[in-house]
């Protein structure tokens, strides 16, 4: 598959986790190959095994330490590589100098959960994960609501232009089930994308009161 | 835009040795990974070498390994191809190319192409 397209992309968590994706048209399901990290300006180095995600996809994580470790700074370069067993030896397949704080994706917000519900309105709160102190105050935010009767896909964005870890839905209709999901994005990074979205929380507004217009 | 050009083709001997430069310009070019690749007449655009801007990391095609030498100056924004113990079949027209993030030894993987300087290795 020389010439058909290939892609290796990495993300790096802020922490301790990069996790990669290397996809190529043609490659054999059964192929093994691994990514190497040398950081060049550290003293280890790291391997994970690519596992198949798809047909011609591959994924892996690289674990750098205990997931709170702050384990790459802005400064740092990983040089990445891409080995593939062919017979007897390894193949390298790819490389790419890695810049860990161009190419961030946070793990997906978690402990959401409910502060207040009225009829009509929601407050709710979460937490950021494996989050690098280096952000201070610099990340946003993306919420969703889901409606009965609607997808996901359908739901507005709101966006959250500052570090703020709570909301307080609007507009709700009385005595409705609905489900809220978040994610969150540093400002920082070229390559940066948006974190997956969180575990969905489920909660459902008050009643309106008995002959009461609330 | 990103440009490239290329320079230092020519006719040579067998066994003989060239030095092809690729110079990289244009307001978008920040420090990409690049490669050189080569076309035969009547044949398919072939994978020759790659380097990464920052570490330096290279990859090579086995019909050259040994024999090729790619690297780069950073302070001119300029790519080398050191070609020794050429043969025949290293006839071709070499193009440079540059790739986003990542070299790999799919022409696919590499967005912007110079125009190719040819060389043609005699017996």
């Known amino acids: 598959a020389v010439n058909g397209t290939s892609q290796f992309t990495c993300f790096y968590n802020s922490r301790a986790n990069i996790s990669c994706v290397w996809s190529q048209d043609g490659a054999l399901q059964d192929t093994s190959c691994q990514v190497h990290a040398w950081p060049d300006r550290r003293r280890w180095n790291q391997t994970c095994e690519l596992l198949p995600v798809s047909q011609a996809s591959w994924a892996c994580n690289l674990i750098l330490g205990a997931p709170d470790s702050q384990k790459l700074t802005t400064v740092d370069i990983v040089t990445l590589r891409v080995l593939c067993r062919e017979g007897v030896r390894w193949r390298v397949m790819a490389i790419q100098d890695f810049k860990p704080f161009e190419n961030l994706r946070l793990m997906a917000p978690i402990s959401l959960q409910v502060v207040h519900v009225e009829t009509h309105r929601c407050n709710i709160s979460w937490e950021i994960s494996q989050a690098s102190h280096y952000f201070e105050r610099h990340l946003e935010f993306e919420a969703r609501t889901l409606s009965p009767g609607h997808t996901w896909e359908e739901a507005p964005l709101l966006t959250l232009k500052q570090k703020q870890e709570w909301i307080c839905l609007e507009t709700l209709t009385p005595d409705t089930q609905y489900e809220f999901q978040v994610r969150v994005k540093p400002l920082q990074g070229e390559f940066t994308t948006w974190s997956p979205w969180s575990q969905p929380l489920a909660f459902r507004t008050k009643p309106a009161a008995l002959g009461k217009d609330t | 835009e990103v440009q490239l050009v290329e320079s230092g083709g020519g006719l040579v001997e067998a066994g003989g040795s060239l030095r092809l430069s690729c110079a990289a310009s244009?307001?978008?070019?920040?420090?990409?990974?690049m490669g050189w690749f080569r076309q035969a007449p009547g044949k398919e655009r072939e994978f020759v070498a790659a380097?990464?801007?920052?570490?330096?990391?290279?990859l090579y095609a086995d019909s050259v390994k040994g024999r090729f030498t790619i690297s780069r100056d950073k302070s001119k924004n300029t790519v080398y191809l050191q070609m020794s113990g050429l043969k025949p079949e290293d006839t071709a027209l070499y193009y440079c190319?540059?790739?986003?993030?990542?070299?790999?030894?799919?022409?696919?993987?590499?967005?912007?192409w110079g125009q190719g300087t040819q060389v043609t290795v005699s017996s």
């Open positions: 190319a540059a790739a986003l993030k990542t070299i790999t030894r799919g022409q696919h993987d590499y967005t912007y």
């Open positions: 244009g307001r978008a070019f920040n420090n990409f990974p």
């Open positions: 380097i990464t801007w920052i570490s330096g990391s290279t």
